[in-house]
Every structure is written in structure tokens, then in C-alpha cells.
């Protein structure tokens, strides 16, 4: 899982992914549900080696969170070829893996 710390790094990560699915976890250190789902998110990055997993701390990277219109945490966004192809909010393990499977 790659930690994103700037808007430039975020754009570069999307560009570098090519045709691969990119999953972005928008979270915060003070967010309980974010902490709860983090180990599962990391396990998915091992299970789905053909998917790019990114993490954005909304406090450290407010410009990315703002550009992606993140309103609550955790929010998971899904990108393909630089385009957003899916999004949902909440620490929902089942929906997270289901969405990856549908979009991969």
C-alpha cells in the first residue's frame, strides 16, 4: 500500500497504474472505523497483486481529499485509466472486496 503525500504524487500514481485498477483509501488517524478496516485493506493489497492500493491521510493531504470531494472517512475511491469508476464510504469489508472484484 503506497502512502500518498501530495497532489503530484497522487496524479503520478494514477498515471503509472496504466490499465490497472487503483483503490484509494481516504482516512484519518483520529478515525476509529478507518483504523478498524486498515489491516483488512492491507491484506487485500497482498491478495490482489494486480491492483494498486493507495492511502491518503486527509489531514496530511487536504488538496487531494478536496479535489476528490471526500466528505467522510473512510471513503474508498476506485480509478481506472485516471477516471473514477466507483466510490463508497464506510468501513465495509464486504463491499470493499466486492467492488474490487467487480472493477478489476
Amino acid at each position: 500500500v503506497k502512502q500518498i503525500e501530495s497532489k503530484t504524487a497522487f496524479q503520478e500514481a494514477l498515471d503509472a497504474a496504466g490499465d490497472k485498477l487503483v483503490v484509494v483509501d481516504f482516512s484519518a488517524t483520529w478515525c476509529g472505523p478507518c483504523k478498524m478496516i486498515k489491516p483488512f485493506y492491507h491484506s487485500l493489497s497482498e491478495k490482489y497483486s494486480n491492483v494498486i492500493f493507495l492511502e491518503v491521510d486527509v489531514d496530511d493531504c487536504q488538496d487531494v481529499a478536496s479535489e476528490c470531494e471526500v466528505k467522510c472517512m473512510p471513503t474508498f475511491q476506485f480509478f481506472k485509466k485516471g477516471q473514477k469508476v466507483g466510490e463508497f464510504s464506510g468501513a465495509n469489508k464486504e463491499k470493499l472486496e466486492a467492488t474490487i472484484n467487480e472493477l478489476v
Epitope: K47, Y48, N50, F88, G90, N92, E94, K95, E97, A98, N101, E102, L103, V104
Partner: antibody
Framework: EVQLQQSGAELVKPGASVKLSCTAS????????MHWVKQRPEQGLEWIGR????????KYDPKFQGKATITADTSSNTAYLQLSSLTSEDTAVYYC??????????WGQGTSVTVSS | QIVLTQSPAIMSASPGEKVTMTCSAS?????MYWYQQKPGTSPKRWIY???KLASGVPARFSGSGSGTSYSLTISTMEAEDAATYYC????????FGAGTKLELK
């Protein structure tokens, strides 16, 4: 405890429509995708499609596009499957299912639909 | 859309015998799922993530495979294992195999 309770058996005439229901208990349907699966007599399982009840987003196997319509009512925690222009090919047991990725997943008891004049 | 081909369609085994059934996918998939179904009942999750046993599944069952080739094995057949087994993949459009009916000899 998670349970999926499906509506009762249906005997319908060719050309008619039927709407099956699947009421969930023990979890909120907004939290996952609800799937529908068809099983014709003595045959295998066929995935019809699924709904994301949180936003109404649906996806169908192309084979069932136009035949099946999946909806959900989050206030009653219920998913629905409507089948239109019924023929004998639609005679089957229809299951709603919570197809999870973990050790457990959950299926309704099935609803038998018989199309006969 | 990924097509899953199961073989054999029907097989029979004596108690104590080793049983292997296969499932071939038309394209590469990440993980295979297996269901057991007995007449008049809903399918039951049997194996998930290719090789993990669902809760309550006896240790004599195992799953393996990768890419396009997967299998379910019973090390020693027991009478209660007689059922139909379906493989299932969870890509963008989920699909099931046609099933392998396992009968007791």
C-alpha cells in the same frame, strides 16, 4: 443471526410477470450487494445479477437483461426480483444470496416459480 | 464473461476412496469458490479463496489451483459427501460451473 427470507411459491401464466421478495434480518442490506441466482429443475446455478441497495446500482448477466429487474427497499431491508414475459424457460427456483468472500455466505431458501397455462 | 467447465459431470465413489473433481476457467481468475448442494436445499459455501474451508466443512476436503485450473479433492469419501458440487468465480460477472454430481457407489 443473518437470515434471508424469500416469498412463497408462484404459479403464473405464460406472458405474465412475477415479483419475488427477499427480506434480510441480522444485517443491513445497504452494507453489501444482494444477488439473485436461478436454478432450473435438475440443472445448475445461473447468476442473474445483483443490486447495491445503498444506491440502487444494478448489474445483470447479459442473458437476463430485459428479463429480470432487481430492486431494493432499504426501509424494509428487502430486495426484489421481477421477471417479465414469462415462458416455460423461466420455470425454476430463484435464490437471493449474500455472496460473501469469507468463510460464510448466506442464501435464501429459494422461491419456486412455475410457468404454466 | 468467464465460462467455468466442470468435469466429470457425474462420478461415483466408494466410502474411503479419494475423489478429485476439476473446474477449468476460460480466462485467468484470482480465486475459486466451491459450493455443495443436496436435493431440495440451498447451496452451501464449501471452499473459498481457492483453498480455504468454510466453517463446518470436514478436513478431508481440500481445494487447490491457480490461473485457469482448479480442483476440489476429498481424501476419503464418506456417505454424507454425496452431493452436487459447483465451482464459482467472482469476477465482474460472476458465473457458476454446471456442477459435478458425486454419487455414493
Amino acid at each position: 443471526e443473518v437470515q434471508l427470507q424469500q416469498s412463497g411459491a408462484e404459479l403464473v401464466k405464460p406472458g405474465a410477470s412475477v415479483k419475488l421478495s427477499c427480506t434480510a434480518s441480522g444485517f443491513n442490506i445497504k452494507d453489501t450487494f444482494m444477488h439473485w441466482v436461478k436454478q432450473r429443475p435438475e440443472q445448475g446455478l445461473e447468476w442473474i445479477g445483483r443490486i447495491d441497495p445503498a444506491n440502487g446500482n444494478t448489474k445483470y448477466d447479459p442473458k437476463f437483461q430485459g428479463k429480470a429487474t432487481i430492486t431494493a427497499d432499504t426501509s424494509s431491508n428487502t430486495a426484489y426480483l421481477q421477471l417479465s414475459s414469462l415462458t416455460s424457460e423461466d420455470t425454476a427456483v430463484y435464490y437471493c444470496a449474500l455472496l460473501q468472500y469469507s468463510a460464510m455466505d448466506y442464501w435464501g431458501q429459494g422461491t419456486s416459480v412455475t410457468v404454466s397455462s | 464473461q468467464i465460462v467455468l467447465t466442470q468435469s466429470p459431470a457425474i462420478m461415483s465413489a466408494s466410502p474411503g476412496e479419494k475423489v478429485t473433481m476439476t473446474c477449468s476457467a476460460s480466462s485467468r481468475i484470482s480465486y475459486m469458490y466451491w459450493y455443495q448442494q443436496k436435493p431440495g436445499t440451498s447451496p452451501k459455501r464449501w471452499i473459498y479463496d481457492t483453498s480455504k474451508l468454510a466453517s463446518g466443512v470436514p478436513a478431508r476436503f481440500s481445494g487447490s489451483g491457480s490461473g485457469t485450473s482448479y480442483s476440489l479433492t476429498i481424501s476419503t469419501m464418506e456417505a454424507e459427501d454425496a452431493a452436487t458440487y459447483y465451482c464459482h468465480q467472482r469476477s465482474s460477472y460472476p458465473t457458476f460451473g454446471a456442477g459435478t454430481k458425486l454419487e455414493l457407489k
